[in-house]
């Protein structure tokens, strides 16, 4: 058993049929010694008396809010949550496996630049009685500070018969050094509580590996005289790190016909313009990637040819 | 050229070669981003290789103030990785494929380090500890981790030379 926060405790249980459970001793936070009784949740049934209460925690029915009273007055509370371990593996019932980039990916994180700011998100099908708390650091043995905000519900989607909820959180490294080469990964830890079930999820990454620039901005076409060719130009996204002579991007320009089956013409360039042939009903798209480190491409910015 | 007295390197040449190094480092291990590299022992390997750190003067302001600190740091790292790529971690069994870019990567590391420090000029003798012997099964993982770290190292070096070529070239 360990304390998650004031008056909230997590009991770690090996979860299998007829498991013996864990013996837990609760102590009433009071100077009083006599006349103390204990109850669980809203029930008025007295579970025991005295300053301490010993219970055997085996299942969710044994978890909940234990309250000690004296003469009708509440003295203190202890909320017990359960953390299940099945076949040596902690349960992951609350969050959905996103399976990208690999199985058992519950948290996904992205950064728009090298400033030390990043966003993580996760999915669940649970709609109520759900709380999250997020902590982060750079490195684990001698952790350096990363400040995370509160997790918020960022999207709701219908997937077949189920509703899916996306939560996200923004974090910022306290003393980020955008130009340096990271040697210690960022660690992100999410505590999830659904009713009386506790679970924790972690992710470890370098900012450089989760970089995904915003799409190029101000994408424009300039027809060239007496030619089917056009000059496409664009700019670095506002959110990208500066100076651009140091934090450089490379770009992919794509000409795509109306039909998905039509052949795509692609040009790669380090410049912020390119000359391409504009076919009728086609569209021109441009995306960006860090020039020197192969992290994710941005989403496409597109304009129609006509 | 970046010589101990402090004259400028051939920024544009360094830019071109460092960008080539980035391409080679990724073609030597393209699937790197899809593998989980935080298995047991990874911290030791990443701690053992050079890193361009915050105080090394490789940020735009530091380069403007005095690029020599950063260039020396990059030079040290290039020599270090060149020695690793020339060691039996890469030359021993299992043999690399004949068309593996590791050979080109090794040569390019040496080439860039020589651009930074031509014959007759010396920063300091490059010291590298004895390498631990490795078995074939260990080499595959070590190669992966070294190339992974090298990708990050040369990315920073390439940014430095690109910025230098754009803003510090005579």
């Amino acid at each position: 058993i360990w304390e998650l926060k004031k008056d909230v405790y997590v009991v770690e249980l090996d979860w299998y049929p007829d498991a013996p459970g864990e013996m837990v001793v609760l102590t009433c936070d009071t100077p009083e010694e006599d006349g103390i009784t204990w109850t669980l949740d809203q029930s008025s049934e007295v579970l025991g008396s005295g300053k301490t209460l010993t219970i055997q925690v085996k299942e969710f029915g044994d978890a909940g809010q234990y309250t000690c009273h004296k003469g009708g007055e509440v003295l203190s509370h202890s909320l017990l949550l359960l953390h299940k371990k099945e076949d040596g593996i902690w349960s992951t019932d609350i969050l959905k496996d996103q399976k990208e980039p690999k199985n058992k990916t519950f948290l996904r994180c992205e950064a728009k630049n090298y400033s030390g700011r990043f966003t993580c998100w996760w999915l669940t099908t649970i709609s109520t009685d759900l709380t999250f708390s997020v902590k982060s650091s750079r490195g684990s043995s001698d952790p350096q500070g990363v400040t995370c905000g509160a997790a918020t519900l960022s999207a709701e989607r219908v997937r077949g018969d189920n509703k899916e909820y996306e939560y996200s959180v923004e974090c910022q490294e306290d003393s980020a050094c955008p130009a340096a080469e990271e040697s210690l990964p960022i660690e992100v830890m999410v505590d999830a509580v659904h009713k009386l079930k506790y679970e924790n999820y972690t992710s470890s990454f370098f900012i450089r590996d989760i970089i995904k620039p915003d799409p190029p901005k101000n994408l424009q076409l300039k027809p060239l005289k007496n030619s089917r060719q056009v000059e496409v130009s664009w700019e670095y996204p506002d959110t990208w790190s500066t100076p651009h002579s140091y934090f450089s991007l490379t770009f992919c320009v794509q000409v795509q016909g109306k039909s998905k089956r039509e052949k795509k013409d692609r040009v790669f360039t380090d410049k912020t313009s390119a000359t391409v042939i504009c076919r009728k009903n086609a569209s021109i798209s441009v995306r960006a990637q860090d020039r020197y480190y192969s992290s994710s491409w941005s989403e496409w910015a597109s304009v129609p040819c006509s | 050229r970046a010589v101990p007295g402090g004259s400028s390197p051939a920024w544009t040449q360094c830019q071109q070669l460092s960008q080539k190094l980035c391409t080679l480092a990724w073609s030597a291990h393209p699937l790197v981003g899809h593998m989980d590299l935080r298995e047991e022992g990874d911290e030791e390997t990443t701690n053992d290789v050079p890193h361009i750190q915050c105080g090394d003067g490789c940020d735009p302001q530091g380069l403007r103030d005095n690029s020599q600190f950063c260039l020396q740091r990059i030079h040290q790292g290039l020599i270090f990785y060149e020695k690793l790529l020339g060691s039996d971690i890469f030359t021993g069994e299992p043999s690399l494929l004949p068309d593996s870019p590791v050979g080109q990567l090794h040569a390019s590391l040496l080439g860039l380090s020589q651009l930074l420090q031509p014959e007759g000029h010396h920063w300091e003798t490059q010291q590298i500890p004895s390498l631990s012997p490795s078995q074939p099964w260990q080499r595959l993982l070590l190669r992966f981790k070294i190339l992974r770290s090298l990708q990050a190292f040369v990315a920073v070096a390439a940014r430095v030379f690109a910025h230098g070529a754009a803003t510090l070239s005579p």
Partner: antibody
Framework: QVQLQESGPGLVKPSETLSLTCTVS????????VHWIRQPPGKGLEWIGV???????DYNPSLKSRVTISRDTSKNQFSLKLSSVTAADTAVYYC??????????????WGQGTLVTVSS | DIVMTQTPLSLPVTPGEPASISCKPS????????????LAWYLQKPGQSPQLLIY???TRQSGVPDRFSGSGSGTDFTLKISRVEAEDVGVYYC?????????FGQGTKLEIK
């Protein structure tokens, strides 16, 4: 928890072979090299040799012709053999471990040591 | 072989006073690439096996009191104890693991005055 335990005869006759065993627990043999170090009574520490995680060995040049280090991974045991011993080989013999990495590491855990006396 | 020269060989100290031990290898232990010094400090208490105090010249092993600190680089290293306590008595050794064979200093015997 991490443990290394040396064992073997406390008395060996001159010209014979000293044989010691180091039994380890609490760590993965894939991740740690195991070393032998000795300390003559009232003197300093001398490195004897190492068996690397991959099974290869390196020995102190001053002892190389007489030393063999081997292992039995199924039993989590490492052995030291030192042939043609003399009174100068009387010492406390320790086994210790270091984390396998690109470069040789430092010894973070040691056994409690076993005294071997060479005498007829 | 790299020769490790430790001084002093004997160090009588009054409890509460600082103590300092020097270790000078015959060649640099600094790896210029990764800026690590391949030097460790050990304390061997009477009748016990050596215990790791400091690694990479200046990183304190977990559980080691913060009165112990290591400094130096290349060919000149120092172990300092800010305020000596009775339990610090024993022999202190430096170890180089830059090249085979690993070599130790001769040891410094710290005793309470």
């Amino acid at each position: 928890q991490v443990q290394l335990q040396e064992s073997g005869p406390g008395l060996v006759k001159p010209s014979e072979t000293l044989s010691l065993t180091c039994t380890v627990s609490g760590f993965s043999l894939i991740s740690y090299n195991v070393h032998w170090i000795r300390q003559p009574p009232g003197k300093g520490l001398e490195w004897i040799g190492v068996i690397w995680t991959g099974g290869s060995t390196d020995y102190n040049p001053s002892l190389k012709s007489r030393v063999t280090i081997s292992r039995d991974t199924s039993k989590n045991q490492f052995s030291l053999k030192l042939s043609s011993v003399t009174a100068a080989d009387t010492a406390v013999y320790y086994c210790a471990r270091d984390k396998y990495g690109l470069f040789p590491g430092y010894f973070d855990y040691w056994g409690q040591g076993t005294l071997v006396t060479v005498s007829s | 072989d790299i020769v490790m020269t430790q001084t002093p060989l004997s160090l009588p100290v009054t409890p509460g006073e600082p103590a300092s031990i020097s270790c000078k290898p015959s060649q640099s232990l600094l790896s210029s690439g990764n800026r690590k010094n391949y030097l460790a400090w050990y304390l061997q208490k009477p009748g016990q096996s050596p215990q790791l105090l400091i690694y990479y010249a200046s990183t304190r092993q977990s559980g080691v009191p913060d009165r112990f600190s290591g400094s130096g680089s290349g060919t000149d290293f120092t172990l300092k104890i800010s305020r000596v306590e009775a339990e610090d008595v024993g022999v202190y050794y430096c170890l180089q693991h830059f090249n085979y064979p690993w070599t130790f200093g001769q040891g410094t015997k710290l005793e309470i005055k």
